[in-house]
C-alpha cells in the first residue's frame, strides 16, 4: 500500500491523528486521548483495481476481470480507495455500566489502502 | 449488511457467480469450477457511512464524525460501498511450480457490504 506523499493522486494512505476530545468522546474514553487512525484517499484507475498488495486482491482481481471486459453490471461499478489492512488498538474506556474496560478494539488503525 | 433485493439503491450485497472458465483460469484451478464471489453496489449517503455491521465501523465512524462536521479533507471524501466482511474458500490449484496445492484462499467471498 502506498503512503501519500503529495506527489501522486493514486490511492494511498494518509496520516491522520484523531483527538477523542475533538469528537466528544473524551468523557467515555479514558486512554489514549487520541490516536493515528489514518485514512485512504486517491484515484483508483482501472489498472490498479485489485492489484496485489491489497488484502481484497483475489476477490477484486476476479471482479476486475469482469469489469475490464465491460461485463454488465461491473462496467459502471466504481473501484474505491479503501482500507485493505486495519490494525487493532488497546483502549481503556467506560462501558454502559460505567465499568472500566481495557480492550483491544479491532479495525481502529488503517495500515494499508487499496482499490476495491 | 443488506442483501440487494432490487427495491433499494442503498449499499448492499449482490449475488454473483464467477466461472473460472469464463476468466481463463480453468487450466490452473482444479476445483471448484467456480464460486459465488458476490459483490457490493449501491449508494452511501452520509447518514449510513460508517454504520455498525461493518468491520470498518470504529474507524469509519470516527472518520464520519469529521466528515459530517465538514472537516477538511473529509468533506469531499466519498463514502464507498465496499466489502466489509469477506470469507475464505478452499481451492485446489497448480502453483507457480506446477505443484498441486490445496489452500484456503483468504478474502474470496463477499459476506457483507458496508459504507467505508
Amino acid at each position: 500500500g502506498l503512503e501519500c506523499d503529495g506527489k501522486v493522486n493514486i490511492c494511498c494512505k494518509k496520516q491522520f491523528f484523531v483527538s477523542f476530545k475533538d469528537i466528544g468522546w473524551n468523557d467515555w474514553i479514558i486512554a489514549p486521548s487520541g490516536y493515528h487512525a489514518n485514512y485512504c484517499e486517491g484515484e483508483c484507475p482501472s489498472h490498479i483495481a485489485g492489484t496485489s498488495g491489497s488484502s481484497l486482491s483475489f476477490h477484486s482481481t476476479v471482479i476486475n476481470h469482469y469489469r475490464m471486459r465491460g461485463h454488465s453490471p461491473f462496467a459502471n461499478l466504481k473501484s474505491c480507495c479503501v482500507p485493505t489492512k486495519l490494525r487493532p488498538m488497546s483502549m481503556l474506556y467506560y462501558d454502559d455500566g460505567q465499568n472500566i474496560i481495557k480492550k483491544d478494539i479491532q479495525n481502529m488503525i488503517v495500515e494499508e489502502c487499496g482499490c476495491s | 449488511g443488506l442483501e440487494c433485493d432490487g427495491k433499494v439503491n442503498i449499499c448492499c450485497k449482490k449475488q454473483f457467480f464467477v466461472s473460472f472458465k469464463d476468466i481463463g483460469w480453468n487450466d490452473w484451478i482444479i476445483a471448484p469450477s467456480g464460486y459465488h464471489a458476490n459483490y457490493c453496489e449501491g449508494e452511501c449517503p452520509s447518514h449510513i457511512a460508517g454504520t455498525s455491521g461493518s468491520s470498518l465501523s470504529f474507524h469509519s465512524t470516527v472518520i464520519n464524525h469529521y466528515r459530517m462536521r465538514g472537516h477538511s479533507p473529509f468533506a469531499n471524501l466519498k463514502s464507498c460501498c465496499v466489502p466489509t466482511k469477506l470469507r475464505p474458500m478452499s481451492m485446489l490449484y497448480y502453483d507457480d511450480g506446477q505443484n498441486i496445492i490445496k489452500k484456503d484462499i483468504q478474502n474470496m467471498i463477499v459476506e457483507e457490504c458496508g459504507c467505508s
Epitope: 482501472s46 496485489s52 498488495g53 491489497s54 | 481463463g24 507457480d96 489452500k103 483468504q106
Partner: antibody, heavy 123, light 108 residues
Framework: QVQLVQSGAEVKKPGASVKVSCKAS????????IHWVRQAPGQGLEWMGH????????NYAQKLQGRVTMTTDTSTSTAYMELRSLRSDDTAVYYC????????????????WGQGTLVTVSS | EIVLTQSPGTLSLSPGERATLSCRAS???????LAWYQQKPGQAPRLLIY???SRATGIPDRFSGSGSGTDFTLTISRLEPEDFAVYYC?????????FGGGTKVEIK
C-alpha cells in the same frame, strides 16, 4: 507444452518506435498476465510492466510511462510491447514472460519466458 | 519500490563446492513472494525457486532457497558444470516488480 515465441531482432534509429510481439501457445492465454523485462548488454534485468491478457489492464514501470504501450490480441494469443522515442540506452534484449499475479494464492513468479528480442538503437 | 541487493557480485568456485548467494530487500517482502532465476549467456532467464523456498518444475534438489522478510538465500549444495551462470532474485510482493543486480557464479 507452454511456449512464448518472440519476433526477430530489430535495428532502429533514435526517435523511432519498435513493436515486439510475443506469441503464446500451450496454455489458456487469457488466464495469465504477460510481463515485459529488458536487459541492456552486460547488465541486469529490468521490469518494464505487464498486461492482463484477459482484461487488457496494464501496469507500467514509472520510468517508461508515456513511452511504452502493451497490448494483446486474444484471437491470436499474442502480446505486443511498443516502445516509442527510442534512445541509445534502450538498446537491450526484450523478454516477455507469463505470470499469474494473484497474491492471495501465492502466485506471481515468471514461470515461462520468451527467447528474447534484441533491439538495437543506433544512428 | 523494493530495492533488492545481491551479494557477492561474483562468486568464484570449483565444481563440487557449495555456493551461497544472498539477496537483501530494502523492505519486507510480503509472504515470501521472492523468486530466483538462473540465466546463461545468450539465454532467457529460467525460474529456479518461487515463494522463497519452493523449487520450480524440473529443478534439481541441489538448488534450495530460504529466508523471509528482508533476507533471502539461494544455496547450490554441490556445483555442477552447468550451474555456472548468473543468478537473479526478484520480488513479486509489490509493484513495480524488481530484480536484484545479479550474482555471477564462475569457475575458479
Amino acid at each position: 507444452q507452454v511456449q512464448l515465441v518472440q519476433s526477430g531482432a530489430e535495428v532502429k534509429k533514435p526517435g523511432a518506435s519498435v513493436k515486439v510481439s510475443c506469441k503464446a501457445s500451450g496454455y489458456t492465454f487469457t488466464g495469465y498476465h504477460i510481463h515485459w523485462v529488458r536487459q541492456a548488454p552486460g547488465q541486469g534485468l529490468e521490469w518494464m510492466g505487464h498486461i492482463s491478457a484477459y482484461s487488457g489492464t496494464t501496469n507500467y514501470a514509472q520510468k517508461l510511462q508515456g513511452r511504452v504501450t502493451m497490448t494483446t490480441d486474444t484471437s491470436t494469443s499474442t502480446a505486443y510491447m511498443e516502445l516509442r522515442s527510442l534512445r541509445s540506452d534502450d538498446t537491450a534484449v526484450y523478454y516477455c514472460a507469463r505470470a499469474r499475479d494473484i497474491a492471495a494464492a501465492g502466485l506471481g513468479a515468471f514461470d515461462y519466458w520468451g527467447q528474447g528480442t534484441l533491439v538495437t538503437v543506433s544512428s | 519500490e523494493i530495492v533488492l541487493t545481491q551479494s557477492p557480485g561474483t562468486l568464484s568456485l570449483s565444481p563440487g563446492e557449495r555456493a551461497t548467494l544472498s539477496c537483501r530487500a530494502s523492505q519486507s517482502v510480503r509472504s515470501s513472494y521472492l523468486a530466483w532465476y538462473q540465466q546463461k549467456p545468450g539465454q532467457a532467464p529460467r525460474l529456479l525457486i518461487y515463494g522463497a523456498s519452493s523449487r520450480a518444475t524440473g529443478i534439481p534438489d541441489r538448488f534450495s532457497g530460504s529466508g523471509s522478510g528482508t533476507d533471502f538465500t539461494l544455496t547450490i549444495s554441490r556445483l555442477e558444470p552447468e550451474d555456472f551462470a548468473v543468478y537473479y532474485c526478484q520480488q513479486y510482493s509489490n509493484y513495480p516488480r524488481t530484480f536484484g543486480g545479479g550474482t555471477k557464479v564462475e569457475i575458479k
